[in-house]
Structure formats: C-alpha cells, structure tokens
Interface confidence: medium
C-alpha cells in the first residue's frame, strides 16, 4: 500500500488554484500540481513556478521554494559579485579591502531562507598588538609591535619544549577578535596521543595525533548502550584519565519470550531494547501459568543479561 500525499505546505509559495484543489487531497503517488513561489523566492529550476509531484517518499521537490539573494555593493570591498544572484544554501567569499573585513572575522556569507547570513559588509578591522601575546617557554623574534588583520607571525620554543603538533616553532595569526591563539610551548612529556578507543562507543570529535595538557575529549555510546563513567577524558601528564564504558543493552526477543511462554506486559514489540538497570515487565501468554516467582516477572537488565521468567 503506497502512502498518498497530503495537501502540500509550500513555504514561501503555494499551489495555483489552491482553494479549488484542497478538497481533493490526499492524492495518489504520481500526481503533479503547478505551484508558484513568493517574491524573493524561486523554484529549484530557477523559475517563479514549476510542478510539485507526489512520490513514494512524499512531495518532490521537498523544498519547493528557495530564497534568492542578490549580492549587494560592498563599501570598502571588492565587488566582483555585485548584483550576482545566489540561491538558498549557496555560500560565497567576501573580499574586503586591506584593513577591512566581515564582522567576527568571518570570510564567507551564505544565502539562507531569511536572506544573507551574515550581511555582506566590510567593516574596519582592528589590529593586533605584540603586547597581547603571552608566551611561556618560547620567544617571538619579530620586531614589529602592531600587526594588521591576517598577518601571521612565527614563534619558537625553548629546547625541550614543543608546539601542540610536536614542532619546535609555530605561528599565530591576527584575526578580527585578536590573535588566533596564544603560542603554545609545552614540555614534550606532558602531551597525549589520541584518547583510548572504547568498545561500542566513539569520541564525538575528530581525532588529533597529539593533544596538549588539559585537553578534553567527549565520548558517546552506540544507540541503546549506556555510558558508565565520565563522558569526558582529560589529558594530564601525558596520560588520559579513565575513559567511560559502554554497557550492553538487554535485547528482549520474541524467540526468547516464546521459549518461556511469556510476553511483554503492556507492549507488543517483537524486539525490545532495555538499558542496564531498567525493569522489564513480563506476563504469561494466554493459557499459561507462572512457573517462577512473581518477582521474576519484573526482570532487571544487568549489562546485557536478563533472566526471563517462565510460564507452563
């Protein structure tokens, strides 16, 4: 049985002759209807109208009306995109004159349903001062004291110290909100490699090859597995703190229930997942009587193991 389509809710547009058509919904797969988009929006084909059609997966296109954004004139910027049309989801780089940039040191703008984000404009950007740099166990040999936006400066670490990725020197960049980072020169022995892998779980972030002291990494478990311990590990003195465990769920199967002539109380699931500590309520199938204690019908999941009650 193929699911029919309900009346389409076309954001920023609508069906032609909408009121005449509304009573005939839901409609069968394969039906086509012409629709229009409001001002500032267009169809995926770039027109102000097109056809929307009912498929097995619902209406196609899924987003019938896309925002149009026209690139504005940039004061204090390069205007190679001036007047160009961009469609919802498109991004483009904004090139500002030296000393100018987008707010918050961003370099790209995106056409969204509500228009440009952020608004393309070039504002005066601040410079960075050498006096704002704190460097322990290293030094900067550059002579200037003021640096313009996007200027990169090098620093060197003392012998026995290294940057986060194990080099004897590194660089920082002057950004809209100040320096990209403070220079890091750390005692080599205090760094950590990637955090330990865990069974049935993973880190939530991409793995680096080297981590600086006090780095924190978060773990998550696979669906239905329960995280036991701290979500986070911390790098300290070259070692990670104890990672969490992902505890097996109990999988209550129809096969095991049939063997014991029981069923789930108040549920009709063929397969049911329970976490450690969860109570699973069973009852005898029709025509069977309890063969184990009344308490056993409130079974508790313990790290993937559940003791089923029995009915005869």
């Amino acid at each position: 049985q193929v699911k029919p389509c309900d009346f389409p809710d076309i954001k920023h547009g609508g069906l032609f002759h909408e009121n005449m058509r509304r009573p005939y919904f839901p409609v069968a797969v394969g039906k086509y209807y012409s629709y229009y988009c409001d001002e500032h929006f267009e169809t995926p084909s770039g027109s102000y109208w097109d056809y929307i059609h009912c498929t097995q997966n619902g209406w196609s296109p899924a987003v019938p009306c896309l925002r149009k954004c026209y690139f504005p004139y940039l004061e204090n910027g390069y205007n190679q995109n001036y007047g160009r049309k961009f469609v919802q989801g498109n991004s483009t780089e904004v090139a500002c004159h030296p000393g100018y940039g987008l707010p918050k040191a961003q370099t790209t703008v995106t056409c969204t349903e509500k228009g440009w984000s952020p608004t393309p404009r070039c504002i005066r950007v601040r410079t960075c001062s050498k006096s704002d740099i704190e460097i322990e166990n290293g030094f900067i040999s550059e002579s200037s004291s003021i640096y313009i936006l996007n200027k990169e400066i090098q620093y060197k670490c003392k012998p026995g110290y290294a940057t986060a990725d194990g080099n004897s020197s590194g660089s920082i960049t002057c950004l809209q909100n100040g320096w990209s980072a403070q220079p890091i020169c750390i005692n080599s022995s205090e760094k950590c490699g990637p955090p330990p892998p865990i069974s049935n779980g993973d880190t939530t972030s991409f793995l680096l090859k080297v981590y600086v002291p006090q780095s924190r990494v978060e773990y998550q478990c696979q669906p239905y597995y329960e995280l036991q311990g701290s979500n986070y590990v911390t790098c300290s003195n070259g070692e990670w703190s104890e990672p969490p465990r992902c505890i097996h769920p109990c999988i209550i199967t129809e096969e095991n229930m049939n063997k014991n002539n029981i069923k789930l109380k108040g549920r009709s699931d063929r397969k049911y997942y329970a976490k450690t500590g969860d109570t699973i309520e069973f009852m005898c199938k029709l025509g069977y009587n309890a063969n184990t204690s009344i308490l056993s019908f409130q079974a508790v999941c313990r790290e993937g193991i559940v003791e089923y009650p029995r009915c005869e």
Epitope: A162, G166, P197, T203, F206, L207, V210
Partner: antibody, heavy 124, light 107 residues
Framework: QVQLQQSGPGLVKPSQTLSLTCAIS??????????WNWIRQSPSRGLEWLGT?????????VYAVSVKSRITINPDTSKNQFSLHLNSVTPEDTAIYFC??????????????WGRGTLVTVSS | EIVLTQSPGTLSLSPGERATLSCRAS???????LAWYQQKPGQSPRLLIY???SRATGIPDRFSGSGSGTDFTLTISRLEPEDFAVYYC????????FGGGTKLEIK
C-alpha cells in the same frame, strides 16, 4: 625513493605471537611528519587498520579497539624500522599484513606508502 | 565506529567509459577525512584521493573524488585498461575504517 620492506614468518601457531618487522628506507621512523602503521587484509574482515606509532617530540602509539589488548607496535630508531607483535593469535588473525606510512598532518590519517604485504597463516 | 558501505559491489564497464563508485558512511564524515585507494590483484593498495577530492602525487586527472557528509563518490572519467581493479574508501576522522570495496571489471 621511499620504500618499506617487510619481513617475518608466514606461519604462526595458534596462541603464539605474530611478529613482523618493517624496514624504512628514504625516510625516518622518528620523522615529525609521518606515522607508521600496520593494516591487515582478509576475505572475512576486508582492510583493517591495527595501529600506529609516531614521534612528535615523544613517541605515541595508537591501537584499534579490536586488537588493543593483544597488540604492540615498537619503533626502532637505531635500525630505522618498526615492528608489530600480536599475541594469542587464532585462525581469525590469518591475513595479509601491510606496513604503511601516513604523512597526514595533525588531523589526517591516510596511507600514501605501503609495504608489499606478508601473508601470515595461523595454523597448527 | 563509522561503517563505510561501498556500492556497487561489482561494476562491469568497457575501456573509455565513465565509472562512478559510491561510498556511504553510517554517520557524517567531514569531507577532509575521506580517502580512496586502488588495489590490483597481488599488489598493495595505492592512495588515489585524500581529503575527499585531492589527488595524491602521480595520480592521473581522470580520477576525481567528491562528496560530503555521508555520501562520497569516486569518478574515473575515461577508463583505461589499467584502471580495472578493486577500489576502497577509507575514513580517518574517528579511528580508521575502510569500506568493503568495489570491484571494477572489464565488460
């Protein structure tokens, strides 16, 4: 031209330790921009990354969770090589073992250089 | 761990044709962290593409990679006789995992 030369026995008895060595020429095992890995390939498991060793002002070892309790990868700076030791082997560990180099940066792990592979059979 | 599923399992094409190989991840992979390899019988895998779309040194420009999120594609624009082999994708964002491979054979 950088090359990786593998050596080690092709037959190991169950419960014993599988040991392979990978000699590096044209690069250094203690390079600050490379990582040295072992990967195996079998019909049942496909390509499986086992672990890596690398130097970033100190030595780091990272192992796959599937073999974590049984594996050791050791660098040998004097011979410019690295080795794999996998203990308590079973017939499941029968595979072609490759040593590889990864020259990805701090975030990247991909393998631009591979040894020729050693077929290791675990059988009594 | 992230599971990579490659399709089709086998692709039969003729020299000169265009090949499109797919790699789908069980969860989102940053496009920076996907690589493609080629392996011929009796040989080691060879790196073709890293960072989803950057060609490795010495790889002909008929090989190109694209994609982001969970769907990635390796395209060979015009098949040469030496391109018939098995192709693997690999992610290296969280640990390291490989796809099961696509065998590209001569039709």
């Amino acid at each position: 031209q950088v090359q990786l030369q593998q050596s080690g026995p092709g037959l190991v008895k169950p419960s014993q330790t599988l040991s392979l060595t990978c000699a590096i020429s044209g690069d250094s095992v203690s390079s600050n921009s490379a990582s040295w890995n072992w990967i195996r390939q079998s019909p049942s498991r496909g390509l499986e990354w086992l672990g890596t060793t690398y130097y970033r002002s100190k030595w780091f070892n990272v192992y796959a969770v599937s073999v974590k309790s049984r594996i050791t990868i050791n660098p040998d700076t004097s011979k410019n090589q690295f080795s794999l030791h996998l203990n308590s082997v079973t017939p499941e560990d029968t595979a072609i073992y490759f040593c590889t180099r990864d020259r990805g940066d701090l975030l990247h792990w991909y393998f631009d250089l591979w040894g020729r592979g050693t077929l290791v059979t675990v059988s009594s | 761990e992230i599971v990579l599923t490659q399709s089709p399992g086998t692709l039969s094409l003729s020299p000169g044709e265009r090949a499109t190989l797919s790699c789908r991840a069980s969860q989102s992979v940053s496009s920076s962290y996907l690589a493609w390899y080629q392996q011929k019988p009796g040989q080691s895998p060879r790196l073709l593409i890293y960072g989803a779309s950057s060609r490795a040194t010495g790889i002909p420009d008929r090989f190109s990679g694209s994609g982001s999120g969970t769907d990635f594609t390796l395209t060979i624009s015009r098949l040469e006789p030496e391109d018939f082999a098995v192709y693997y994708c690999q992610q290296y964002g969280r640990s390291v995992t490989f796809g099961g491979g696509t065998k590209l054979e001569i039709k």
